[in-house]
C-alpha cells in the first residue's frame, strides 16, 4: 500500500508511567505511549508489533503519521481514536494485520484530516455499515478520505455467518455517501466473486481501483461509465473467462484509464471474438501480449493477440432431441 | 445458552505445567470472545487471559504474560489455557467464560463454566 513510511532517524521510548494516561487529560507536547516510538519531527508514532489490544489512549497531539500495524486490537469501537484535544493532524493510519474482526459504526469519527486508511490482512467478519460515515443518515457528512486500502479483509469462510461478505463490504462504501472524494480503494484478495452493480457509480472520485486475486467471473452487470477519473484498474488473478462488448465499450471510454489482466482462465471460443478484436486495436491493456487462453483444452496456453476469427468457434449445440445421455 | 465445561486441572509442584481445556456445547456466534478467569481462596473472580474466536487476537493479565498462553480450536469449539512455570500464586478455581466485548471485566462475559481447580504446591 501506500501509506507513507517515517523519514524519522530519531525516536522517543515511551516512559511506562504515561500508559496511565486517559483520553481526556490534554497529552503533553513530547508525550509518547507505552509500548511505542514517537518522532515529533517527523509527525510519527510507531506502536508495531507490540501486541497492542486497544488504541493507546495517551497519543501526542502532533501525529500526522500513525502506525498500529501488527497488534492484537480484535475491536475498533465508536470513537476508537476520539481525544480531547481531538487528533486534528492525523492523515494516515495503518492498522493492517492486528487481528481486527470487528470495526464499529463511527470508529474512525473525529478524525478530519484522515486521508489514508489501511485495514488490510484483518479477518473482518464484523464491518459495520457505518465504519467510515459514523452515521447511519442517509446522507452523512463528507469523510476526508482519499485512500482505503482493504486488501486481504476477508475472514475464513466458515465464519462468515452466512453474509455476503462483498455486500458487507459494499454497504460500509456506500453509506450516507461519506465516501464521494475517495479516490484509491483497493480490494485485492478477499475472495469476491461478484461486483455489486451499484458501487463503482456511487464512487465516482476514483483514479484507482485494484480488483486483484479475487474471484471475479464477469463483469457483465458492472458499470465503470461513470468512472470519468479512473486511471488504472487491476483485475490480475481473478476467474474471468470474457470481456463482453458493453464492458469494452466502456473501458473504452475511459480517458486516462490503464487496465490489468493478467492470470484470468480466458475462454477462447465464438464468445471471444469481440474482445480479441478490441484488444488488437486497444492501448488501455497493459501487458496484452500476456494474454493467453485456459480454455478449451485445444486453444490452452495460446495468446489472444495472435488469434483469429476462425480460431474462436463454439461447438454447436445439439437440440434436445439428439442429445445423448 | 452454551454450556462451557472446563478441564485438565488438578495437582503441579511450582515451576510445572498443565494445559486447560474449555468445550463449547455449540459455537457461541453470539460469543465473540473466549475467556479464561481465576478466583483464590477468599479473593474476587480475576482476569487471566481472552482469545477471539475469529481473528484470535489475544490478551492477558500481566501477572501471567509470557508464562500462559490461550489458544483456540475453532472446529471442535475449544479454548485453551497452557500454563508455565507455575507458582504458588497461580492456585485457584479456573473458570472459562464467552461474552461478546474485548474486555478484561467480570461483567463482559455472560456464560460461564463450572470452574476447575489448579493446585501449585511443593
Known amino acids: 500500500s501506500s501509506s507513507p513510511t517515517s523519514s524519522a532517524s530519531s525516536f522517543s521510548s515511551s516512559a511506562p508511567f504515561l500508559a496511565s494516561a486517559v483520553s481526556a487529560q490534554p497529552p503533553l507536547p513530547d508525550q509518547c505511549p507505552a509500548l511505542c516510538e514517537c518522532s515529533e519531527a517527523a509527525r510519527t508514532v510507531k506502536c508495531v508489533n507490540r501486541n497492542l489490544t486497544e488504541v493507546p489512549t495517551d497519543l501526542p497531539a502532533y501525529v500526522r503519521n500513525l502506525f498500529l500495524t501488527g497488534n492484537q486490537l480484535a475491536v475498533l469501537p465508536a470513537g476508537a481514536f476520539a481525544r480531547r484535544p481531538p487528533l486534528a493532524e492525523l492523515a494516515a493510519l495503518n492498522l493492517s494485520g492486528s487481528r481486527l474482526d470487528e470495526v464499529r459504526a463511527g470508529a474512525f469519527e473525529h478524525l478530519p484530516s484522515l486521508r489514508q486508511l489501511d485495514l488490510s490482512h484483518n479477518p473482518l467478519a464484523d464491518l459495520s455499515p457505518f465504519a467510515f460515515s459514523g452515521s447511519n443518515a442517509s446522507v452523512s457528512a463528507p469523510s476526508p478520505l482519499v485512500e482505503l486500502i482493504l486488501n486481504h479483509i476477508v475472514p475464513p469462510e466458515d465464519e462468515r455467518q452466512n453474509r455476503s461478505f462483498e455486500g458487507m463490504v459494499v454497504a460500509a462504501l456506500l453509506a450516507g455517501r461519506a465516501l464521494q472524494g475517495l479516490r484509491r480503494l483497493e480490494l485485492a484478495s478477499n475472495h469476491f466473486l461478484y461486483l455489486p452493480r451499484d458501487v463503482l457509480a456511487q464512487l465516482p472520485s476514483l483514479r484507482h481501483l485494484d480488483l486483484s486475486n479475487n474471484s471475479l467471473v464477469s463483469l457483465t452487470y458492472v458499470s465503470f461509465r461513470n468512472l470519468t477519473h479512473l486511471e488504472s484498474l487491476h483485475l490480475e488473478d481473478n476467474a474471468l473467462k470474457v470481456l463482453h462488448n458493453g464492458t469494452l465499450a466502456e473501458l473504452q471510454g475511459l480517458p486516462h484509464i490503464r487496465v490489468f489482466l493478467d492470470n484470468n482462465p480466458w475462454v477462447c471460443d465464438c464468445h471471444m471474438a469481440d474482445m480479441v478484436t478490441w484488444l488488437k486495436e486497444t492501448e488501455v491493456v497493459q501487458g496484452k501480449d500476456r494474454l493467453t487462453c485456459a480454455y478449451p483444452e485445444k486453444m490452452r496456453n495460446r495468446v489472444l493477440l495472435e488469434l483469429n476469427s476462425a480460431d474462436l468457434d463454439c461447438d454447436p449445440i445439439l437440440p434436445p432431441s439428439l442429445q445423448t445421455s | 445458552e452454551v454450556q462451557l465445561v472446563e478441564s485438565g486441572g488438578g495437582e503441579v509442584q511450582p515451576g510445572g505445567s498443565l494445559r486447560l481445556s474449555c468445550a463449547a456445547s455449540?459455537?457461541?456466534?453470539?460469543?465473540?470472545?473466549m475467556a479464561w478467569f481465576r478466583q483464590a481462596p477468599g479473593k474476587e473472580r480475576e482476569f487471566v487471559a481472552a482469545?477471539?474466536?475469529?481473528?484470535?487476537?489475544?490478551r492477558y493479565a500481566e501477572s501471567v504474560k509470557g508464562r500462559f498462553t490461550i489458544s483456540r480450536d475453532n472446529a471442535i469449539n475449544t479454548v485453551y489455557l497452557q500454563m508455565n512455570s507455575l507458582k504458588s500464586e497461580d492456585t485457584a478455581v479456573y473458570y472459562c467464560a464467552a461474552g461478546q466485548a474485548w474486555g478484561t471485566k467480570f461483567t463482559d462475559y455472560s456464560d460461564w463454566g463450572q470452574g476447575t481447580l489448579v493446585t501449585v504446591k511443593p
Open positions: 455449540r459455537r457461541p456466534f453470539s460469543s465473540k470472545t
Open positions: 482469545v477471539r474466536w475469529i481473528g484470535g487476537a489475544t
